[in-house]
């Protein structure tokens, strides 16, 4: 549109002047003037601002509190806030990651479909037939059972979800 | 203070191109637009166009439109104007110009605050 | 375009004389006007914005008024630094045109 009906992209109407924004790492210290320019600082050591700002103050950066299982995943800059992820073995209880819970094992007769990660919880699936898993576990997938006849062998006790077959000798009474 | 720096005078041949430059100092590049006017010897001030230094977007006059690009470097504050085809009635002193823009009455105006020193583009052959 | 038409192209005057420049567009432009001064080799200058606004650091002496198509810049008590050469513009329709210009000699 012409004439303008509004201020610039990264500017901000303040005493019927359209002052500029302080870029990002940057908080504002003073309003424009007719007689002067918009006066900005750079965020201090562990402070940031992300975006084109009027901020007077900088946000502090996150904490990775190690007491809740978080450590430093990307170190925060002036423009960017510190991302947090799990020790090990732990995962985000939200998107924010506050805070880690254990990851969680899959049950005997269940296998593990989706090992967890940092920011996600262990997937588990039931073992179908053919498959079993007999321990809790965060890592082990369902086991196919044995094939008992690719060792000449036969089938005693079948397999369930949780068990394998059982495979013995074939009978030899048996034509 | 607002400061705005143009680069050196310069002598080219019709046909050629030319690139003037214009560094600004003492305020933040990326929030204001910025603006090229040039003015022939002896002559009045015409309107070229202007850059949008924090997107690069720019609008050119009709006269220039396929023969003038402007562009900009926000890492070192400095935007360019670009004019290819030289003809010898391109001579002129190029000026670049920051938009400054008041609020008034429901509306915003715009006006040229601060001004480079201009760069002279002189086209013989 | 927008044309916009100054009045008089050249102007001779004395120190302390009151000068009146007009400036007249081809259609109308509500208030989005401005004056600007410039001297020989150097850039132009903004003295007046929004047809009546005086730029700040610009002595009192200059003042424009006007509205729609009709414009007017005045200096009140020329000084000998006001010799110079005086340009309108419209902001009011790409392009953003300029007055021919109103060169102001010492008489």
């Known amino acids: 549109p012409e004439p303008p009906t509004a201020c610039r992209e990264k500017q901000y109407l303040i005493n019927s002047q359209c002052c500029s924004l302080c870029q990002p790492g940057q908080k504002l210290v003073s309003d424009c003037t007719e007689f002067t320019e918009t006066e900005c600082l750079p965020c201090g050591e562990s402070e940031f601002l992300d975006t084109w700002n009027r901020e007077t103050h900088c946000h502090q950066h996150k904490y990775c509190d190690p007491n809740l299982g978080l450590r430093v995943q990307q170190k925060g800059t002036s423009e960017t806030d510190t991302i947090c992820t799990c020790e090990e073995g732990w995962h985000c209880t939200s998107e924010a990651c506050e805070s880690c819970v254990l990851h969680r094992s899959c049950s005997p007769g269940f296998g593990v479909k989706q090992i967890a990660t940092g920011v996600s919880d262990t997937i588990c699936e039931p073992c179908p037939v053919g498959f079993f898993s007999n321990v809790s576990s965060a890592f082990e997938k369902c086991h196919p059972w044995t094939s008992c006849e690719t060792k000449d062998l036969v089938v005693q006790q079948a397999g369930t979800n949780k068990t394998d077959v059982v495979c013995g000798p074939q009978d030899r009474l048996r034509a | 203070q607002v400061q705005l720096v143009q680069s050196g005078a310069e002598v080219k041949k019709p046909g050629a191109s030319v690139k003037v430059s214009c560094k600004a100092s003492?305020?933040?590049?990326?929030?204001?637009?910025m603006y090229w006017v040039r003015q022939a010897p002896g002559q009045g001030l015409e309107w070229m166009g202007w850059?949008?230094?924090?997107?690069?977007?720019?609008t050119y006059a009709q006269k220039f439109q396929g023969r003038v690009t402007m562009t900009r470097d926000t890492s070192i504050s400095t935007a360019y104007m670009e004019l290819s085809r030289l003809r010898s009635d391109d001579t002129a002193v190029y000026y670049c110009?920051?938009?400054?823009?008041?609020?008034?009455?429901?509306?915003?105006?715009?006006?040229?605050?601060?001004w480079g020193q201009g760069t002279l583009v002189t086209v013989s052959s | 375009d927008i044309q916009l038409t100054q009045s008089p192209s050249f102007l001779s005057a004395s120190v302390g004389d009151r000068v009146t420049i007009t400036c007249r567009a081809s259609?109308?432009?509500?208030?989005?006007l401005a004056w600007y001064q410039q001297k020989p080799g150097k850039a132009p200058k903004l003295l007046i914005y929004?047809?009546?606004t005086l730029q700040s650091g610009v002595p009192s002496r200059f003042s424009g008024s006007g509205s729609g198509t009709e414009f007017t810049l005045t200096i009140s008590s020329l000084q000998p630094e006001d010799f110079a050469t005086y340009y309108c513009?419209?902001?009011?329709?790409?392009?953003?045109?300029f007055g021919q210009g109103t060169k102001v000699e010492i008489k």
């Open positions: 110009a920051r938009e400054k823009i008041y609020y008034g009455s429901g509306n915003y105006y715009p006006s040229f605050d601060y």
């Open positions: 003492g305020y933040t590049f990326a929030g204001y637009y």
């Open positions: 850059i949008n230094p924090d997107s690069g977007a720019p």
């Open positions: 259609q109308g432009i509500s208030s989005y």
């Open positions: 929004a047809a009546s």
């Open positions: 513009q419209q902001l009011m329709s790409y392009p953003w045109t």
